[in-house]
């Protein structure tokens, strides 16, 4: 057993049938002696009676809150929370594995450029009784500061019959060195409580690896006199890195025909601007990516040809 | 050329090759799946590689006030990596395919390391540790790891000279 | 075509030594291993050892306690096996075999004993 | 080291049916959670043995009605219609950890 937080306490189950459980002694937070009896949630029968209450912890029904009272008077409470290990495995109830970019990823995170910023976000079915606490650090062993907001509910998706909830926690690490090559990753950490089971989601990376900048702004194209050709030209995002001499976007231009199925032509530039061939409902897509460091692209940027 | 005592070195030469060094980087080990380290042990396969660090003057800022301490530090990378991808983690089994980027990526090390120090000059240079891994498969998780860090040094060696190539060069 | 021809039957007294050799021809000596494995009458394989002779790497079993010696000689692309201190319990047919151990630069790795020796057979009997 | 135990010792099987062998390591002969370090060696009497399965790639040359299975501790190596020329003993072979260790041999007949 661990406290979570004041009055919160886990405790952690070997989950199994038949599983003995844990034996827990609870302590009224309170100078009396005597006359004191203990309660579990809203239920009105007494438990036990004296300033420490042990009990044997097998299943969700012993978890809840704990309050001792003297003569109808409220004198302390403790919270007991369930974390379930199943074959030597914490459970992973509350999170939706997003399977990307490998099984069991319940965290993704992603930086828009060098300065520290990153946002994580996860999914859970779950709607109500639900909350998230989320720390992170630079290191584990020595760790290095990094502030996290409050996690929120960014978006509600249906799929198929159930709803899907995605949260999102921004966090920004105190002392960030941009130019600096990261030797530490960042960890993040998420506590996750539903009801009365309690979980708990963690990420490693460095910042370089989660980079992914925003499209590129500004897309515009200038026919060329007497030809189908045209010049792309664009922009880097606002929320780039800078100077852009030093943090440069290699960027893709690509044309898109109104079907799918049709051609793609590719081509790569460290310029911000290309000359491409403009087909007839075709589309000019630009994407940008760190030009020193495979990172994820960026989303597209388009404009059609006419 | 980074003549130690301070003048300036081929930014433009020193921009492409290391550009060149990214694209080797990447080709010698792309990011296919993702490996699972975790079941790995890591004892024995530890590597402590130079990094740029916060105070090493990397930074723009840096680079316009003084230059010499970020193209040191970078010298002195090179010379690690190069020695590393000439040691036996890389030529010992299981031996790399012939047509592995490993190779280029060694002379390209070189190359660079020598556009940064002439013959006669000499920065100081970081003690390679010696890692003989006794089990190969170790090799594959050393040369994993180390050419992961090669790509972020490299990224930052070539954001470095880029920028000196933009703004220092006479 | 690859070959690999080893040296004719032995029979040794205990505790003396035995050297068996497996030349090599049809390929680069050099791009590829020579795995030793030996296989005790009516019983399984035992992988003894591996010598790499591009990187001169060797590889043993400690289980023979020093007591065997890998060797290749490049110039006549022929591999040695010694074993020393030999006892009853040694008696066994020893193969060589072509190694190939091959990665891209970190996974997957491809690992082959392709192609065998006959086989020598050493006999350990006072 | 690593121990490889094979199973069954010795296996008798009809003329077209299938054969299956089993291999548990006594630790994880997988790389990074998937690239496979464990082999399959077939041996006719009086012969070397013969590299048939690598990994998890079936050599060229032999018949596809071998496959390769598992990772981790547990493989199998399948024979999905037993024909009179598979009779041989079958040996796996890990090559994660030096010393390289190999099971002790399936015996594999026609009943």
């Known amino acids: 057993i661990w406290e979570l937080k004041k009055d919160v306490y886990v405790v952690e189950l070997d989950w199994y049938p038949d599983a003995p459980g844990e034996m827990v002694v609870l302590t009224c937070d309170t100078p009396e002696e005597d006359g004191i009896t203990w309660t579990l949630d809203q239920s009105s029968e007494v438990l036990g009676s004296g300033k420490t209450l042990t009990i044997q912890v097998k299943e969700f029904g012993d978890a809840g809150q704990y309050t001792c009272h003297k003569g109808g008077e409220v004198l302390s409470h403790s919270l007991l929370l369930l974390h379930k290990k199943e074959d030597g495995i914490w459970s992973t109830d509350i999170l939706k594995d997003q399977k990307e970019p490998k099984n069991k990823t319940f965290l993704r995170c992603e930086a828009k450029n060098y300065s520290g910023r990153f946002t994580c976000w996860w999914l859970t079915t779950i709607s109500t009784d639900l909350t998230f606490s989320v720390k992170s650090s630079r290191g584990s062993s020595d760790p290095q500061g990094v502030t996290c907001g409050a996690a929120t509910l960014s978006a509600e998706r249906v799929r198929g019959d159930n709803k899907e909830y995605e949260y999102s926690v921004e966090c920004q690490e105190d002392s960030a060195c941009p130019a600096a090559e990261e030797s530490l990753p960042i960890e993040v950490m998420v506590d996750a409580v539903h009801k009365l089971k309690y979980e708990n989601y963690t990420s490693s990376f460095f910042i370089r690896d989660i980079i992914k900048p925003d499209p590129p702004k500004n897309l515009q194209l200038k026919p060329l006199k007497n030809s189908r050709q045209v010049e792309v030209s664009w922009e880097y995002p606002d929320t780039w890195s800078t100077p852009h001499s030093y943090f440069s976007l290699t960027f893709c231009v690509q044309v898109q025909g109104k079907s799918k199925r049709e051609k793609k032509d590719r081509v790569f530039t460290d310029k911000t601007s290309a000359t491409v061939i403009c087909r007839k409902n075709a589309s000019i897509s630009v994407r940008a990516q760190d030009r020193y460091y495979s990172s994820s692209w960026s989303e597209w940027a388009s404009v059609p040809c006419s | 050329r980074a003549v130690p005592g301070g003048s300036s070195p081929a930014w433009t030469q020193c921009q492409q090759l290391s550009q060149k060094l990214c694209t080797l980087a990447w080709s010698a080990h792309p990011l296919v799946g993702h490996m699972d380290l975790r079941e790995e042990g890591d004892e024995e396969t530890t590597n402590d590689v130079p990094h740029i660090q916060c105070g090493d003057g990397c930074d723009p800022q840096g680079l316009r006030d003084n230059s010499q301490f970020c193209l040191q530090r970078i010298h002195q990378g090179l010379i690690f990596y190069e020695k590393l991808l000439g040691s036996d983690i890389f030529t010992g089994e299981p031996s790399l395919l012939p047509d592995s980027p490993v190779g280029q990526l060694h002379a390209s090390l070189l190359g660079l390391s020598q556009l940064l120090q002439p013959e006669g000059h000499h920065w100081e240079t970081q003690q390679i540790p010696s890692l003989s891994p006794s089990q190969p498969w170790q090799r594959l998780l050393l040369r994993f790891k180390i050419l992961r860090s090669l790509q972020a040094f490299v990224a930052v060696a070539a954001r470095v000279f880029a920028h000196g190539a933009a703004t220092l060069s006479p | 075509q690859v070959q690999l021809v080893q040296s004719g039957a032995e029979v040794k007294k205990p505790g003396s030594s035995v050297k068996v050799s497996c030349k090599a021809s049809?390929?680069?000596?050099?791009?590829?291993?020579i795995t030793w494995v030996r296989q005790a009458p009516g019983q399984g394989l035992e992988w003894m050892g591996e010598d790499y002779p591009r990187s001169g790497n060797t590889y043993y079993n400690e289980k023979f306690k020093g007591r065997v010696t890998i060797t290749a000689d490049k110039s006549t692309s022929t591999a040695y096996m010694e074993l020393s201190s030999l006892r009853s319990e040694d008696t066994a047919v020893y193969y060589c075999?072509?190694?190939?151990?091959?990665?891209?630069?970190?996974?997957?790795?491809?690992?082959?004993?392709?192609?065998w020796g006959q086989g020598t057979l050493v006999t350990v009997s006072s | 080291d690593i121990v490889m135990t094979q199973s069954p010792d010795s296996l008798a099987v009809s003329l077209g049916e299938r054969a299956t062998i089993n291999c548990k390591a006594s630790k994880k002969v997988t790389i990074f959670g998937s690239t496979s370090a464990l082999h399959w060696y077939q041996q006719k009497p009086g012969q070397p043995p013969k590299l048939i399965y690598n990994g998890a790639k079936l050599e060229s040359g032999v018949p596809d009605r071998f496959s390769g299975s598992g990772s981790g501790t547990d493989f199998t190596l399948t024979i999905s219609s037993l024909q009179a020329e598979d009779v041989a003993v079958y040996y796996c072979?890990?090559?994660?950890?030096?010393?390289?260790?190999f099971g002790g041999g399936t015996k594999v007949e026609i009943k």
């Open positions: 049809g390929y680069t000596f050099t791009s590829y291993g």
């Open positions: 075999a072509r190694s190939e151990f091959i990665s891209t630069v970190v996974a997957p790795y491809y690992y082959a004993l392709d192609y």
């Open positions: 072979l890990q090559n994660k950890e030096v010393p390289y260790t």
